[in-house]
Interface confidence: low
């Protein structure tokens, strides 16, 4: 039985050219997190955080993705093409896999007011 829940930053908006933090937290379980995968809307992997091996940022994103804070991910130099869904996948022992969803909307600088909130999807 999987008892945990993933809390995410939910729906967020950020300015073009700026940066944004994507954050997921696993709670209500004592399962050990062995790996966290971060994927983009087209299911391409942005980064992996393995508990034993540390961070691996995929080459296509090395210029614009920074690890952290914590198990989160920081996207930098945002473009309009970054708008879309992002997924955190928590691989845990013994529970199995938990998945969280974040929707990022990148807005023209004149429009956006950076917003983020924690929510349980």
């Amino acid at each position: 039985m999987m008892t945990g829940t993933i809390e995410t930053t939910g729906n967020i908006s950020a300015k073009k050219g700026g940066s944004v933090i994507l954050q997921c937290h696993l709670s209500s379980t004592m399962a050990q997190v062995t790996q966290v995968n971060w994927e983009q809307h087209d299911h391409s992997l942005l980064a992996i955080r393995n508990a034993e091996l540390g961070w691996h940022i995929y080459p296509a994103f090395k210029d614009r993705v920074a690890p952290g804070p914590g198990l989160g991910l920081t996207l930098q130099s945002l473009t309009m093409n970054d708008t879309g869904e992002y997924f955190c996948t928590y691989h845990t022992y013994p529970d199995g896999t938990y998945r969280g969803r974040i929707f990022l909307e990148v807005l023209e600088s004149s429009v956006a007011e950076h917003s983020a909130r924690f929510q349980i999807p």
């Epitope: 039985m1 999987m2 209500s28 004592m30 050990q32 508990a51």
Partner: antibody, heavy 117, light 106 residues
Framework: EVQLQQSGPELVKPGASVKISCKAS????????MHWVKQSLGKSLEWIGY????????GYSQKFKSKVTLTVDRSSRTAYMDLRSLTSEDSAVFYC??????????WGQGTLVTVSA | QIVLTQSPAIMSASPGEKVTMTCSAS?????MHWYQQKSGTSPKRWIY???KLASGVPARFSGSVSGTSYSLTISSMEAEDAATYYC?????????FGAGTKLELK
């Protein structure tokens, strides 16, 4: 090298409280939960609960819920266990143990708590 | 809560003898782990994920499962194997230990 260094032995009076510490080194502290285990003299091991080293979330065995509070201080890489309303039944060795994929690969050296008037 | 019943509680074996101890789970568990503990010391992870030997554990040790009955076997007893062995399961938010099997040298 992973090490869990626990605080020293405690002699406490019935009804009192005690706080045991477990200082971690040799790994990324916030990546692993810290668990606590009780072993009464000549008896088996009993799981008390865990604390999430990243966000402080806790989970307790039903038996210990009213007896124990688990906390963590990320800055000093230390986990704590508060035991309250102590009785002779609480006299035991208490271990901290680091969570990992296959059970508890790393244990502290244990802290002996003796409850006596 | 899943109950783990270890048997026998106490056993003795001569050097070179094959030793088997069991841990029976009251219901299905994900994996079983085994710990070795000698008097006055902390437990050591001995076998994990049912059948994997922890670092430094001699190859004479093995772990297996049949249904909900888990076994730790020593192919040829040695003096240093005298200790208490505990099984432990971890299934979601339930974590329990068995009462232990004390293995003595005959």
């Amino acid at each position: 090298e992973v090490q869990l260094q626990q605080s020293g032995p405690e002699l406490v009076k019935p009804g009192a409280s005690v706080k045991i510490s477990c200082k971690a080194s040799g790994y990324t502290f916030t990546d692993y939960n810290m668990h606590w285990v009780k072993q009464s003299l000549g008896k088996s091991l009993e799981w008390i609960g865990y604390v999430n080293s990243f966000n402080g979330n806790t989970g307790y065995s039903q038996k210990f819920k009213s007896k124990v509070t688990l906390t963590v201080d990320r800055s000093s890489r230390t986990a704590y266990m508060d035991l309250r309303s102590l009785t002779s039944e609480d006299s035991a060795v208490f271990y901290c143990a680091r969570s990992s994929r296959g059970g508890f690969a790393y244990w502290g050296q244990g802290t002996l708590v003796t409850v006596s008037a | 809560q899943i109950v783990l019943t270890q048997s026998p509680a106490i056993m003795s074996a001569s050097p070179g003898e094959k030793v088997t101890m069991t841990c029976s789970a009251s219901s299905s568990v994900s994996y079983m782990h085994w710990y070795q503990q000698k008097s006055g010391t902390s437990p050591k992870r001995w076998i994990y994920d049912t059948s994997k030997l922890a670092s430094g554990v001699p190859a004479r040790f093995s772990g297996s499962v049949s249904g909900t009955s888990y076994s730790l076997t020593i192919s040829s007893m040695e003096a240093e194997d005298a200790a208490t062995y505990y099984c432990q399961q971890w299934s979601s938010n339930s974590l329990t230990f068995g009462a232990g099997t004390k293995l003595e040298l005959k």
